[in-house]
Amino acid sequence: EINGSANYEMFIFHNGGVQILCKYPDIVQQFKMQLLKGGQILCDLTKTKGSGNTVSIKSLKFCHSQLSNNSVSFFLYNLDHSHANYYFCNLSIFDPPPFKVTLTGGYLHIYESQLCCQLK
């Protein structure tokens, strides 16, 4: 397992919400990506392929998510101060082998300007 800080902008704020970007190498074909808040699994997305190369995408802990060919974005809405925490992208690579797990993360700071529906 590889642990490290994300070497890219992991948090993108918009409209009182945040997009948490979890990147993976282009070469990765099949994987599970989990978003952890502290040690708790908030969201996950699994991409696998069958024997006919058909893609299956599954979520056991569903969040609004977006898949591209080198990242999974998880979206959190209605931000408040309780969202401030360490967030980690836990990537399990199934294909290509060998099986590997990588953990990258960062701290989500919540500032007044990023909160939804602030009281003026």
Epitope: I27, Q30, T48, K49, G50, S51, G52, N53, S56
Partner: antibody, heavy 117, light 111 residues
Framework: EVQLVESGGGLVQPGGSLRLSCAAS????????MDWVRQAPGKGLVWVSN????????EYSPFVKGRFTISRDNAKNTLYLQMNSLRAEDTAVYYC??????????WGQGTLVTVSS | DIVMTQSPDSLAVSLGERATINCKSS??????????LTWYQQKPGQPPKLLIF???TRHTGVPDRFSGSGSGTDFTLTISSLQAEDVAVYYC?????????FGPGTKVDIK
């Protein structure tokens, strides 16, 4: 250790039906696509059908489409193949196989289906 | 559907000698940096066993006398020094798209 055990084969008349089962153990069944592959006596391997981890995607060989139905029960760790309108050319050993992400990495011993009058 | 062909249909090789099996696909199996081509071994009365995946990667526990090569439409399985336990039928298989298909098999015997 991964184990796949097929059952349900036997002798059936043309036009008849049969349901094959494959009991899986030794791995997290609900994490894997599963397949059926058949082999007629003295012949080569022919892919029949597959199903994704949750049972929401199923694919079929043109030879069996519309006649065979693949399904799974993840609570029972079991894969099924419902075979209807059977023909003499469906006579074969039917293997249950785990699709290990990039290859069939585990196979059962097979169950023989004979379609004959 | 992609058609897989194998040559020869059968071959007999002396113990310790090299055996070479060819597999050809009717269209390229290369996607990105991967060839979606697999080799299986089937001994009499047994289910098939995975040997090589992605054209050239040996499966866990497969002896290093087995090697796979090739790219695109032309692939080769080589047994560098044939052993008695290698007597079997060898199948190539693609998973480039649906339906996945197998080659007709090549029977390897001892001369």
């Amino acid at each position: 250790e991964v184990q796949l055990v097929e059952s349900g084969g036997g002798l059936v008349q043309p036009g008849g039906s049969l349901r094959l089962s494959c009991a899986a153990s030794g791995f997290t069944f609900s994490d894997y696509w599963m397949d059926w592959v058949r082999q007629a006596p003295g012949k080569g391997l022919v892919w029949v059908s597959n199903i994704d981890e949750s049972g929401s995607i199923a694919e079929y060989s043109p030879f069996v489409k519309g006649r065979f139905t693949i399904s799974r029960d993840n609570a029972k760790n079991t894969l099924y193949l419902q075979m209807n309108s059977l023909r003499a050319e469906d006579t074969a050993v039917y293997y249950c196989s785990r699709w290990g992400r990039f290859a069939f990495d585990s196979w059962g011993q097979g169950t023989l289906v004979t379609v004959s009058s | 559907d992609i058609v897989m062909t194998q040559s020869p249909d059968s071959l007999a090789v002396s113990l310790g000698e090299r055996a070479t099996i060819n597999c050809k696909s009717s269209q390229s199996l290369l996607s990105g940096s991967f060839n979606y081509l697999t080799w299986y071994q089937q001994k009499p009365g047994q289910p098939p066993k995975l040997l090589i995946f992605y054209a050239s990667t040996r499966h866990t526990g497969v002896p290093d006398r087995f090697s796979g090569s090739g790219s695109g439409t032309d692939f080769t399985l080589t047994i560098s020094s044939l052993q008695a336990e290698d007597v079997a039928v060898y199948y190539c298989h693609h998973h480039y798209n649906a339906p996945p298909t197998f080659g007709p098999g090549t029977k390897v015997d001892i001369k």
